[in-house]
Amino acid sequence: FVRTKIDTTENLLNTEVHSSPVQRWSMQVPAEVSAAAGDAAVLPCTFTHPHRHYDGPLTAIWRAGEPYAGPQVFRCAAARGSELCQTALSLHGRFRLLGNPRRNDLSLRVERLALADDRRYFCRVEFAGDVHDRYESRHGVRLHVTAAPRIINISVLPGPAHAFRALCTTEGEPPPALAWSGPALGNGSAAVPSSGQGHGHLVTAELPALNHDGRYTCTAANSLGRSEASVYLFRFHGASAST
């Protein structure tokens, strides 16, 4: 249920010093990992370093958004000689270290994915014993979260000249296509997303004029599924309209 593509290597491996290969700092991460909302995903990250058999204290860190400055989502620390990296930070309790930093593996597990997790993540390791050194991936791994459409709001609002308009907001990835159907609209009348309303994974479509009483249905669809929701318009003639 998790897809990974294109391995990238940052600052690759070894140089020759007196004909003895010495590892340089490098981090290997895939360009992208794809998983469905609700599932778990693994963000792979392995590294090499020049400090042969380092056994001192270390800290493993993952941050989101941008390298070096992005907010930390996970941090753990391992004491000298220990293979256990004790978690000090796990945002919302959903991030867990899958890899073993002592074996040059910082791979991270993200539980119960949400569309908001769709961003780039950067791994970092810090040595703090006799050796003081650190390294962070520069390009990171993009976590691509997919989701079937979910209509999160459908409403009828007052419009100009005692008319009414309808708004339908959905989320999903790929971004869903929205269509309205209802009285005098025909079957599956497409509604163009309102200008500037495609925000992140949210898509909003407006039906600008509801001219007839009855049921109006918003349908959202993408390659992973479809969802629909309805509103009903009933006007009390001779008084102000209501829904």
């Epitope: 249920f1 778990a40 256990l84 899958l98 073993n100 597990r109 119960r112």
Partner: antibody, heavy 122, light 111 residues
Amino acid sequence: QVQLVQSGGGLVQPGRSLRLSCAASGFTFDDYAMHWVRQAPGKGLEWVSGISWNSGSIGYADSVKGRFTISRDNAKNSLYLQMNSLRAEDTALYYCAKGLWPSYDLDAFDIWGQGTMVTVSS
Amino acid sequence: QSALTQPASVSGSPGQSITLSCTGTSSDVGAYNFVSWYQQHPGTAPKLMIYEVSNRPSGVSDRFSGSKSGNTASLTISGLQAEDEADYYCSSYTSTIPPFVFGTGTKVTVL
């Protein structure tokens, strides 16, 4: 209090079917993975199957793959194990168990049912 | 996959410390820090004592502690008490499918 109450065990002939149920209470059922673990008489524990919080991910032991089906109904706070083509070697005490995490595969089992005996014999 | 290896029995006197071992491979215990320990008294369901190598669930006595070195995980019971007499099983995540493997079990006897 937090508990898992099991039902559905019994004596069944080889080749027949049986369905085990596990009713959960005292915790938010749809936040956690759930599992079935069995223990043959006088033997150790064997993981049978696990299911993630939303049924999006499911796993089985090789010994039951293709014959057993795990499922859950989050609206009813219930876990099920449909056992088909039963064999004598499936005879065991079957436990349902709550996981610590939403995903089943990196899990540990912190709450256990009382167990239900399944005996496969002609 | 094959079960993790545990000694069949370990015994100790009240007040003593004993250590139970659980030996796996570089595909399970050695590769991941997802080892759990369960205590089972006769005729009762297992009880989680340790998860993720060294974490104790609430309600579990601090006399129980877990650790790991290489491909071997350990459960130490300090200040051994009569009620500690039970079977103990380890479990580990494994990179093979299915992802769980239990140990063969150790019977702890309090002399």
